[in-house]
């Protein structure tokens, strides 16, 4: 099939989860092809390593695309020390990397 | 690790999870053991646009996964989206309503 760029979405941790003392930030890459995609996490513009995990779906039987979730996991204390959370996505279908971000505490 | 039921947290739709007329929302199913869990949406009535990702094993020895669904963004204010999580080893069933975050 032809190249398909991912749709990228970012989700902050829920208030429910923060009450439990942990913060998971999720970056979703939806319906892309080919499978090779790179996700980088930045917190207040500082590159993160070693505190995220990725999971990729099987190739979709209908449109042959893949989807990927990347989860950045932090303690609540660490999460609340910083403001800007961003995932940067590189993929063949994107002319330049796409960044999705949010400011902690803002809608 | 001994048997443990998951915690289920909403991945709430917002402007950060909207693209054109499409919104993404989901559930984070965290810290369970052993595999597997099953996730459906709206008791199985919602199947299109659903991606339930393979579980990952965390350093804690517990599993975690996300299930996400894309829907028309215009539907967010008018209808309910619920993820139905079932972890048979711990006899845990959770129905989590996922709604836009109220600011």
């Amino acid at each position: 099939r032809t190249v398909a760029a991912p749709s990228v979405f970012i989700f902050p941790p829920s208030d429910e989860q923060l009450k439990s003392g942990t913060a998971s930030v999720v970056c979703l890459l939806n319906n892309f092809y080919p499978r090779e995609a790179k996700v980088q996490w930045k917190v207040d513009n500082a590159l993160q390593s070693g505190n995220s995990q990725e999971s990729v779906t099987e190739q979709d039987s209908k449109d042959s695309t893949y989807s990927l979730s990347s989860t950045l996991t932090l303690s609540k204390a660490d999460y609340e020390k910083h403001k800007v959370y961003a995932c940067e996505v590189t993929h063949q279908g994107l002319s330049s990397p796409v960044t999705k971000s949010f400011n902690r505490g803002e809608c | 690790a001994s048997t443990k039921g998951p915690s289920v947290f909403p991945l709430a739709p917002s402007s950060k999870s909207t693209s054109g007329g499409t919104a993404a929302l989901g559930c984070l199913v965290k810290d369970y053991f052993p595999e597997p869990v099953t996730v459906s949406w709206n008791s199985g009535a919602l199947t299109s646009g659903v991606h339930t990702f393979p579980a990952v094993l965390q350093s804690s020895g517990l599993y975690s996964l996300s299930s996400v669904v894309t829907v028309p963004s215009s539907s967010l204010g008018t209808q309910t989206y619920i993820c139905n999580v079932n972890h048979k080893p711990s006899n845990t069933k959770v129905d989590k309503k996922v709604e836009p975050k109220s600011c």
Epitope: K62 | G20, G21, N42, G49, P72, S75, G77, T78, Q79
Partner: antibody, heavy 110, light 110 residues
Framework: QSLEESGGRLVTPGTPLTLTCTAS????????MNWVRQAPGKGLEWIGT?????TAYYASWAKGRFTISRTSTTVDLKAASPTTEDTATYFC???????WGPGTLVTVSS | DVVMTQTPASVSEPVGGTVTIKCQAS??????LAWYQQKPGQPPKLLIH???ILESGVPSRFKGSGSGTEFTLTISDLECADVATYYC????????????FGGGTKVEIK
């Protein structure tokens, strides 16, 4: 932002027909899309919807009679074997309902 | 599929009067309902979505209300420009619902 339907014409019963919807000013690929028709002097009739991932669902009367599909730039409606009862103006519209095409007229007649 | 029943089929009121149009869904659709205005030779125009939310640019004389299975469109201070056919549509997203329209209400000036 606008939509336009094309492919409407006079066909004889049983002749396959494909209508195409194209967008200007926005990307079709991130919108759920509807096909709707209106027979002369009659009301609006929902035919079906296509989701972002290409899943189509249809009005019960339209199942087996119409097929909706999409590419990255178009949304198509195919009538495999139209009958005279399918004579109508066919509209494509965003699922939100905020943008409609002007419609394309299909006349099925022997 | 959800069936939408719209009443009355036609209504005639003087300029400045009030028109009330009812729409009933065969099962609960929460507030997933849209109202459209259609004039001859034109595609429908979205007036209200989410049962009561006025589209940008639509006069506040148009008011939508209701939830579940019973919905109402009220047009107050009727103007000549309001002469048209009005349709309700179920906008509930889900394969078992469908997005059917009501049969339409023709509004005329007495």
């Amino acid at each position: 932002q606008s939509l336009e339907e094309s492919g409407g014409r006079l066909v004889t019963p049983g002749t396959p027909l494909t209508l195409t919807c194209t967008a200007s000013g926005f990307s079709l690929s991130t919108y759920y899309m509807n096909w709707v028709r209106q027979a002369p002097g009659k009301g609006l009739e929902w035919i079906g919807t296509i989701t972002i991932d290409g899943t189509a669902y249809y009005a019960s009367w339209a199942k087996g009679r119409f097929t909706i599909s999409r590419t990255s730039t178009t949304v198509d409606l195919k009538a495999a074997s139209p009958t005279t009862e399918d004579t109508a103006t066919y509209f494509c519209a965003r699922y939100d309902g905020d943008i409609w095409g002007p419609g394309t007229l299909v006349t099925v007649s022997s | 599929d959800v069936v939408m029943t719209q009443t009355p089929a036609s209504v005639s009121e003087p300029v400045g009067g009030t028109v009330t149009i009812k729409c009933q869904a065969s099962q609960s659709i929460s507030t997933a309902l849209a109202w459209y205005q259609q004039k001859p030779g034109q595609p429908p125009k979205l007036l209200i979505h989410g049962a009561s939310i006025l589209e940008s640019g639509v006069p506040s004389r148009f008011k939508g209300s209701g939830s579940g299975t019973e919905f109402t469109l009220t047009i107050s201070d009727l103007e000549c420009a309001d002469v048209a056919t009005y349709y309700c549509q179920c906008t509930y997203y889900g394969i078992s619902y469908g997005n059917a329209f009501g049969g339409g209400t023709k509004v005329e000036i007495k």
